[in-house]
Amino acid sequence: SIPWNLERITPPRYRADEYQPPDGGSLVEVYLLDTSIQSDHREIEGRVMVTDFENVPEEDGTRFHRQASKCDSHGTHLAGVVSGRDAGVAKGASMRSLRVLNCQGKGTVSGTLIGLEFIRKSQLVQPVGPLVVLLPLAGGYSRVLNAACQRLARAGVVLVTAAGNFRDDACLYSPASAPEVITVGATNAQDQPVTLGTLGTNFGRCVDLFAPGEDIIGASSDCSTCFVSQSGTSQAAAHVAGIAAMMLSAEPELTLAELRQRLIHFSAKDVINEAWFPEDQRVLTPNLVAALPPSTHGAGWQLFCRTVWSAHSGPTRMATAVARCAPDEELLSCSSFSRSGKRRGERMEAQGGKLVCRAHNAFGGEGVYAIARCCLLPQANCSVHTAPPAEASMGTRVHCHQQGHVLTGCSSHWEVEDLGTHKPPVLRPRGQPNQCVGHREASIHASCCHAPGLECKVKEHGIPAPQEQVTVACEEGWTLTGCSALPGTSHVLGAYAVDNTCVVRSRDVSTTGSTSEGAVTAVAICCRSRHLAQASQELQ
Amino acid sequence: QEDEDGDYEELVLALRSEEDGLAEAPEHGTTATFHRCAKDPWRLPGTYVVVLKEETHLSQSERTARRLQAQAARRGYLTKILHVFHGLLPGFLVKMSGDLLELALKLPHVDYIEEDSSVFAQ
């Protein structure tokens, strides 16, 4: 029967006893930077071209015995997971291997850099179709390695990397921490995070998604027909590289931003048991397990959005945190979150010609996160409208006044240390969807966008009694672009989007009296693009 | 994911050297920074990636590398240029004593220097 990992990434529509996806990724070339490989293994013979690139350090230890099958083990298995005939994800993809890891699986940042440069030069000399680069390796945080990945990604190459096997924050490792790279954590057959000895998969905001990474059957370098099970975030990354190859083969014009959004969109949601992660990392770690799209075409009509968390601001009084979208994405809303509840809100501001989301810590706060909602919205023209604190009892209001502009998100930012001592604002009057309302002592920022066929609506869910969490979700066919809380009182820890659901978190109910102050309303802004839907129908 | 310029949990040293008559001060008075791996066992001291400013041409990279070698030699240090980068990032990979970092950071066009470190199969 089909191995569990191939079954897991296959949408129900294709499921039978077989793993037979619609297209094998034949238009895509996948570069593998790893150990040497056994290229005559029956899984990959004729599919993997071994380049003459080699940049590896000497093996440690004077008595190290170099055994070919051991030297090739890691790379052979991964090549098989990506494109192997029996157990591969993208059975049609061709691969090129570069040796940057020695027989002990060790390499250097500099060797990896030279390997990435080699790929770029090859791309310039002989441009082919879409390129995917698989980096099943990790080292400590490296500014230069991340910068090289950024440059290669901006040259149109899709980079996929292992999150790391250190049971730690992936942001502490490279290339996992590079924003332009698709960073993959590992899950097992029970959709649980993979444990590897005393360690396990990395986690946190630098992980884009998870994929099967435990007990993965693949080519073994022991012999030309041998197979073996291996585990790790490398195996998980290889699955995503294979899925990416299949998506790009079906739609070769996809940009990195579009590909990442699709990977996130088609993932299985909320199946991972988050209790495995450290408590402070749970909210930051995406609960997504990669899967192939149910069909190769027809996703273009959707408005795709993802949530991007900033690094933690740190505890100093004036500390801020910034969340950024990718170059091809639009920042449609901005929110903030603080575990202590001490924050001074958030605002959208221009930085280098692009909007960013900045969150502000408050005196005595342990720090804040900025949360950006980043969307693919072609031909969009977005701007931020700000209303200063109103000082009036009705609270501060701001709306999108330009013709054809719709409200995609609301943010509020205040200078006072604690809004909780002040009377909360009244709720926004009904029938005014293009308006943000906030506390009278806060400045309010409305994200207003014009894009062909873009329509948005506001959805609220209020709970009169205090609750730790209030959620509101957008219905089928609509995409969550904005998530905020009414009122902006001190017991609200913040708001953030999880997939298509707006989550507003409050302080533990036991510490909050059941007063009117306890009422919390989650406000979601849900949008869709009629223009994208029409364009998709015309294609079909 | 991590901001490109966010020096997250890593050691960043802005080393200012004494006036070195032979080295041109970096443009705009900016100080190049030194970075190394936060995980000590993974560090590879003695090999450094010298990253130059974005628009630096290959010829300037080669010139900067040669200048570093010449200035190091005057101080009695041997250096070896292992690779000159171009295509992705401008810069070069150099094998040298850590004693020369202050000197290297003052070279023209230098944006930052990173000590080499290990990466591992996952």
Partner: antibody, heavy 119, light 113 residues
Framework: QVQLVQSGAEVKKPGESLKISCKGS????????ISWVRQMPGKGLEWMGI????????NYSPSFQGQVTISADKSISTAYLQWSSLKASDTAMYYC????????????WGQGTLVTVSS | DIVMTQSPDSLAVSLGERATINCRSS????????????LAWYQQKPGQPPKLLIY???TRESGVPDRFSGSGSGTDFTLTISSLQAEDVAVYYC?????????FGQGTKVEIK
């Protein structure tokens, strides 16, 4: 159910060409390797070669390399074994067999095609 | 190529008695990464194609009676029929599948004494 159905017996003269077939059904033909195995009269089993129908990748036993050609047409779920010039020593029963998943051992066999080469 | 040698060439055993067939490979078919022996056993009755009995040297294929068992490791392997039945009269082949070309033993003919 899963099965491999081979073409019927052939009687040929030396020097003639021949192409015998093996049609798979009840499973995803492109995803499983097909081997050809020869059994000469009263003798044992000899592996000739293998094909992966998904991309028509082949691997031959050195003893049969250049003597036969293995091919496949995935659109009709059929594998082929062909000779350009038969010899009397090619007289044998030829079996096609399907690989077990990721193990080159054979769980499903065709019924066999008897090829007789005689002048 | 890995050469597979079976012994004996033929074997006559009384009904209900144990039949033992040996197979030796010219090089080890045991691999360390998954600690498996890449060896299979087949049964071929007259006028029929072969049938898979055992793989990984000792794993019985589903539907195969438990009187058939395989053992051994590295280069030396054994197929045992614990209590011979009339329907077990056949030729038995060992096969290595660790590398191309795949090779079979010459076969052992099992008859009733």
């Amino acid at each position: 159910q899963v099965q491999l159905v081979q073409s019927g017996a052939e009687v040929k003269k030396p020097g003639e060409s021949l192409k015998i077939s093996c049609k798979g059904s009840g499973y995803s033909f492109t995803n499983y390797w097909i081997s050809w195995v020869r059994q000469m009269p009263g003798k044992g089993l000899e592996w000739m070669g293998i094909i992966y129908p998904g991309d028509s990748y082949t691997n031959y036993s050195p003893s049969f390399q250049g003597q036969v050609t293995i091919s496949a047409d995935k659109s009709i779920s059929t594998a082929y074994l062909q000779w350009s010039s038969l010899k009397a020593s090619d007289t044998a029963m030829y079996y096609c067999a399907r690989d077990y998943f990721y193990k080159p051992l054979f769980d499903i066999w065709g019924q066999g095609t008897l090829v007789t080469v005689s002048s | 190529d890995i050469v597979m040698t079976q012994s004996p060439d033929s074997l006559a055993v009384s009904l209900g008695e144990r039949a033992t067939i040996n197979c030796r490979s010219s090089q080890s078919v045991l691999y360390s990464s998954n600690n498996k022996n890449y060896l299979a056993w087949y049964q071929q009755k007259p006028g029929q194609p072969p049938k898979l009995l055992i793989y990984w040297a000792s794993t019985r294929e589903s539907g195969v009676p438990d009187r058939f068992s395989g053992s051994g490791s590295g280069t030396d392997f054994t197929l045992t029929i614990s209590s011979l039945q009339a329907e077990d009269v056949a030729v038995y082949y060992c096969q290595q599948y660790s590398s191309f070309p795949i090779t079979f033993g010459q076969g052992t003919k099992v008859e009733i004494k």
